[in-house]
């Protein structure tokens, strides 16, 4: 029996739980979702039984095989998918378990600025990148672009220290999850720091 396989799916997209059956004469295959019966395929893809009406149009077995394709994915399709392969040549059914996580496509990440100080002509602040709807498993990367630098910084918070008179810099936050990626509007260091320029010791949000 196989190990647990992690599968990612995109909202409204489709996912295939692949099943490689070789050297076994299959009698039937049973698929379950969170322990509830989902579908059964009998000998050589001849008969397909799907009990729930809501799943009938979404469940498919491509190329007459036993691999399960689930379309029009919804958030509540996330969960454990279990397959049992039954054969007279096996004493016990062969099994495989999958964990599906359905992710949303990411919208543009939002950037907020932390407390800003401007001392001795240097503007110091933090930029924080986040998704407005609290999407799961998002990885953040910052790109700092400019004549003096082209750097990447991992994590949602980017510490900035920019000196007046230096060439301008542009900061872009890139958000990724397993199914999509998106980037923020660019932020220019000069514009960001302009607000604190009048009062060299100011701190502002």
């Amino acid at each position: 029996s196989g190990t647990l396989k992690k599968v990612a799916g995109a909202l409204d997209g489709s996912v295939t739980f692949t099943l490689n059956i070789t050297e076994i004469k299959v009698d039937y295959v049973v698929w379950t979702f969170n322990t509830f019966f989902l579908a059964m395929v009998k000998k050589d893809g001849g008969t397909i039984i799907v009990t729930q009406n809501r799943n009938r149009e979404r469940v498919d077995f491509p190329d007459g095989g036993y691999s399960l394709k689930l379309s029009k994915l919804k958030k509540n399709d996330s969960g454990i998918y279990y397959v049992g392969i039954y054969s007279s040549s096996l004493q016990q059914p062969s099994t495989q378990e999958y964990v599906l996580h359905v992710y949303e496509h990411l919208s543009k990440p939002k950037v907020t600025m932390g407390l800003q100080s401007n001392k001795n002509g240097t503007c110091v602040t933090n930029l924080t990148c986040c998704m407005e709807h609290g999407e799961e498993d998002v990885i953040y990367t910052w790109k700092a672009l400019g004549q003096a630098a082209n750097e990447s910084h991992n994590g949602s918070i980017l510490p900035i220290s920019w000196r007046w008179g230096e060439s301008d810099m542009t900061f872009i936050c890139v958000a990724r999850n397993p199914v999509s990626r998106n980037f923020s509007s660019p932020i220019l260091a000069r514009k960001l720091c302009e607000g604190a320029a009048d009062d060299p010791d100011s701190s502002m949000v």
Epitope: V15, I172, R181, F183, P186
Partner: antibody, heavy 119, light 107 residues
């Protein structure tokens, strides 16, 4: 050395089908989004579509969505483009391309494979 | 779809000159623009991304500028090896789109 090598091009009749392959080497293919881009003779570049690392997301240029299917096999380090219902305007050089650092601009291109649609 | 227009199909210049290739987006794309060079018989090569950041190994005579809808690739001190087609690409929204290209000819 990072390399992409397309194959499978050739002469195909209008209405026919063809499957192009792109073999990747020199980098961790399973971590990258991958794209197909085509270039008609003497013309500009046209992005066909992209596929994410685990094949859970595939984005296409809308006008090509119904005739092209992008897929990949990470175990074989190979990207595919299944073309169907081809027409003369699909005659082009087909490139596979890798985005730099998984961003949206392409730093690695294959040499391309030529598809000619003609009766 | 966002249309990227490169109004000059051909541009002629001399070695040592400075030339500017322009690209106009049909709507605001921020700075999500890349430039590529394609020499005859070769695959495209990335020059510039995020409108103005030079890709690794690209000579500093290639400079990108612009934001919003208007973008420029400037080649200063043009060399004979710069004879090529130049394409802009937007990646602000799907589908990614390219300009029609500008062929740079050396007098």
């Amino acid at each position: 050395e990072v390399k992409l090598l397309e194959s499978g091009g050739g002469l195909v009749q209008p209405g026919g089908s063809l499957k192009l392959s792109c073999a990747a080497s020199g980098f961790d293919f399973s971590r990258y989004w991958m794209s197909w881009v085509r270039q008609a003779p003497g013309k500009g570049l046209e992005w066909i579509g992209e596929i994410n690392p685990d094949s859970s997301t595939i984005n296409y240029t809308p006008s090509l969505k119904d005739k092209f299917i992008i897929s990949r096999d990470n175990a074989k380090n190979t990207l595919y483009l299944q073309m169907s219902k081809v027409r003369s305007e699909d005659t082009a050089l087909y490139y596979c391309a890798r985005p730099d650092g998984n961003y949206w601009y392409f730093d690695v291109w294959g040499a391309g494979t030529t598809v000619t649609v003609s009766s | 779809d966002i249309v990227m227009t490169q109004s000059h199909k051909f541009m002629s210049t001399s070695v040592g000159d400075r030339v500017s290739i322009t690209c106009k987006a049909s709507q605001d794309v921020g700075i999500a623009v890349a430039w590529y060079q394609q020499k005859p018989g070769q695959s495209p090569k990335l020059l510039i991304y995020w409108a103005s950041t030079r890709h690794t190994g690209v000579p500093d005579r290639f400079t990108g500028s612009g934001s919003g809808t208007d973008f420029t690739l400037t080649i200063s001190n043009v060399q004979s090896e710069d004879l090529a087609d130049y394409f802009c690409q937007q990646y602000s929204s799907y589908p990614y789109t390219f300009g029609g290209g500008t062929k740079l000819e050396i007098k």
